[in-house]
């Protein structure tokens, strides 16, 4: 797409005559018609395939034509085309005489043609004007012309479309040949690819705009070269994403369990007593009037939401009191003074009359509840989380955040602390609700049977009749030294009385 521009500069018709040789009366009021068509070796009849344009009356007989482009005028004349410029053309310029202001062919006098010039040749697209002068028997026309591309078209024949842009589809300006030139910070065939912050990790980082470094899942830091440990990892590190390698003195999946959790973290609130219930867990014994895993919740008679129909509950020393909204009364605001005519149902609920219109019931859409559909469904009211798990509302669904040692959708599964064989020296492991317990074999003690102990074989007082007991440290057995008058390994038999055997 482009424009053939023709700048008329001077027309000379000194004698003021027509093509027929007759003079104009009173002078030749001259206007021009221009026909642009495909190249013809000899200009022959046929429609103006590249376009036509005409001028108003520009002067009488001989005159100069002023450049009128700056004022939005019609010189240079514009002949737009919406095809690939072929590089060749034929141009016919006719000068006509118009005695009046009506320039239509049928309004002109029978003899009105002053002159006609035709040129044909090649013309490359460019900013430079070609100056030409054509002389016929009685007239002379001086003019210049050129072909330029329309906005957003480039190349030798104005066939290359390029529109500068700075949006999701590209960030570029156009070079004179129509090729794209990316704006700073952009690259790629269509300059859609941002150049990330220098040093941004090739694999772990990316960007959506220049000089940015956004991290892929599992990575962090200005250049996305630091791994993110497992979500919730408290006292641990990683070498690849989602790892949680515990620091010394910490254990558990999230390295968040302390051997002495109670002392280090004081988790129990409101004066509750804290007990370490095995490694990595604790139990809070609440004072009266408190509840919750950490005794953080104050027990309240309003917790059961006894007030209906949007009533608000106020705790009192001896119970509670419901403040009812307009239209309701009763201990629990259960009685209505409203009917369906009052449009009592909120959030798109539909109203149904009851008791001949004396009462009503609301049918609530999903996600709403309450007598008037005034409450968003709280999926946690049924307290679905087991083992002290915390219930969290997440839009239309819910989730349980489990206490350490528990897992599963509803924290119903106990994480077996014994799975990792924590008891040393052949100790037997027992899963408890809040941890584990090791039963140690003889000669070992400690939480994990890690402490070796000397067995005092005499501790159970195996010798009778006031015999003296000695421990044999090499064999962990005992020896009884009998007083006079007693015999036997444990000094259990009096001398002279043989043991009675059953046979």
């Amino acid at each position: 797409s482009g424009v053939f521009q023709l700048q008329l500069q001077e027309f000379i018709n000194e004698r003021g005559v027509l093509a027929s040789g007759r003079p104009c009366e009173p002078g030749c009021r001259t206007f021009f018609r221009v026909c642009l068509k495909h190249f013809q070796a000899v200009v022959s009849p046929g429609p103006c395939t590249f376009g036509t344009v005409s001028t108003p009356v520009l002067g009488t007989n001989s005159f100069a034509v002023r450049d009128d482009s700056s004022g939005g005028g019609r010189n240079p004349l514009q002949l737009p085309f919406n095809f690939t410029w072929p590089g060749t053309f034929s141009l016919i310029i006719e000068a006509w005489h118009a005695p009046g202001d009506d320039l239509r062919p049928e309004a002109l006098p029978p003899d009105a043609l002053i002159s006609k010039i035709a040129i044909q040749g090649s013309l490359a697209v460019g900013q430079n004007w070609l100056l030409d002068e054509q002389t016929s028997t009685l007239t002379r026309l001086r003019y210049s012309y050129r072909v330029i591309c329309s906005d957003n078209y480039y190349g030798d024949n104005c066939s290359r479309l390029c529109k500068k842009r700075n949006d999701h589809f590209g960030h570029y300006v156009c070079q004179p040949d129509g090729n794209l030139s990316c704006l700073p910070g952009w690259t790629g065939e269509y300059c859609q690819q941002p150049i990330c912050l220098s040093g941004c990790h090739e694999q772990n980082g990316y960007c959506s705009k220049p000089a940015e470094c956004l991290c892929r899942p599992g990575w962090q830091g200005r250049l996305c070269n630091e791994c993110i440990p497992h979500n919730g990892c408290r006292h641990g590190t990683c070498s690849t994403p989602w790892q949680c390698t515990c620091d010394e003195g910490w254990g558990g999946l999230f390295c968040d369990q302390d051997l002495n959790y109670c002392t280090h973290h004081s988790p129990c609130k409101n004066g509750a007593t804290c007990s370490n219930s095995g490694q990595r867990s604790y139990t809070c014994t609440c004072r009266p009037g408190y509840t919750g895993v950490d005794c953080e919740l104050e027990l309240s008679e309003c917790d059961s939401n006894p007030c209906r129909n949007g009533g608000s509950c106020k705790d009192q020393e001896d119970g509670y009191h419901c403040l009812c909204p307009p239209g309701y009364y009763g201990l629990h605001c259960e009685h209505s003074t409203l009917s369906c005519a009052d449009s009592p149902c909120f959030n798109g609920g539909s109203c149904r009359e009851r008791n001949q219109g004396a009462n009503y019931a609301c049918e609530c859409p999903p996600n709403f509840t309450g007598s008037n559909c005034e409450k968003k469904v709280d999926r946690c009211t049924s307290n679905p989380c087991a083992n002290g798990g915390q219930c969290l509302n997440r839009g239309p669904s819910r989730m349980c955040r489990c206490r350490p040692g528990f897992t599963g959708t509803y924290c119903e599964l106990h994480v077996s602390d014994c799975a990792r064989n924590p008891c040393a020296h052949g100790g037997t492991c027992h899963d408890l609700e809040n941890g584990l317990m090791c039963t140690c074999p003889a000669g070992f003690s400690g939480r994990r049977c890690e402490v070796r102990t000397s067995i005092d074989a005499c501790a159970s007082s195996p010798c009778f009749n006031r015999a003296t007991c000695y421990t044999d440290l090499s064999t962990d057995t005992f020896v009884c030294n009998c007083p006079y008058g007693f015999v036997g390994s444990r000094c259990e038999f009096p001398v002279g009385l043989p043991p009675s055997f059953p046979w």
Epitope: V43, S44, P45, P47, K116
Partner: antibody, heavy 120, light 110 residues
Amino acid sequence: EVQLQQSGPELEKPGASVKISCKASGYSFTGYNMNWVKQSNGKSLEWIGNIDPYFGGTNYNQKFKGKATLTVDKSSSTAYMQLKSLTSEDSAVYYCARNYDYDGGCFDYWGQGTTLTVSS
Amino acid sequence: QAVVTQESALTTSPGETVTLTCRSSTGAVTTSNYANWVQEKPDHLFTGLIGGTNNRAPGVPARFSGSLIGDKAALTITGAQTEDEAIYFCALWYSNHWVFGGGTKLTVLG
């Protein structure tokens, strides 16, 4: 008033040549193209060719190249069509009609037609 | 050479709107074919009506209009009159020559 006045009917023998004229008046003769059209058996039209009287440039229907020759005399505002090597196929009514390139070539004015009969 | 096809005959009544069409054997008719419409009345009286697809010739009544409909050129007479009974020829331009159609005989029942 624009008028195109054609020469009268012609009776020619096969093999002969004939020159039909069309005199223009009421407009600038050299500002418009002159077309020639053949009407056989009183129905269909065939375009023969046209001429630009100012420059003398011509276009011909391939079928009539070598058969028809178009010329003008600017001084008398007259267009001519010569047909040579006549045969009975050339018997028809021939019309001149002007048109103007700038408005897409409307054949606005026509001559009254010249009847050519080729017979031995 | 291209062949230009028209309806051979159409009939209408005074005051009715009638559309005559002109098809090209080479494909769709476009503005580059500069469709022309010519009226022939008895005694070989020819008058040009439309040039360049839709340019009405001087003196031609406004009820005559030219256009492109689909892949054809069209001449529409809006509110036909008895004097519009005639043969209508279309002509299409093909780069360096004109080709006429076979003509449509329009009858206006009076």
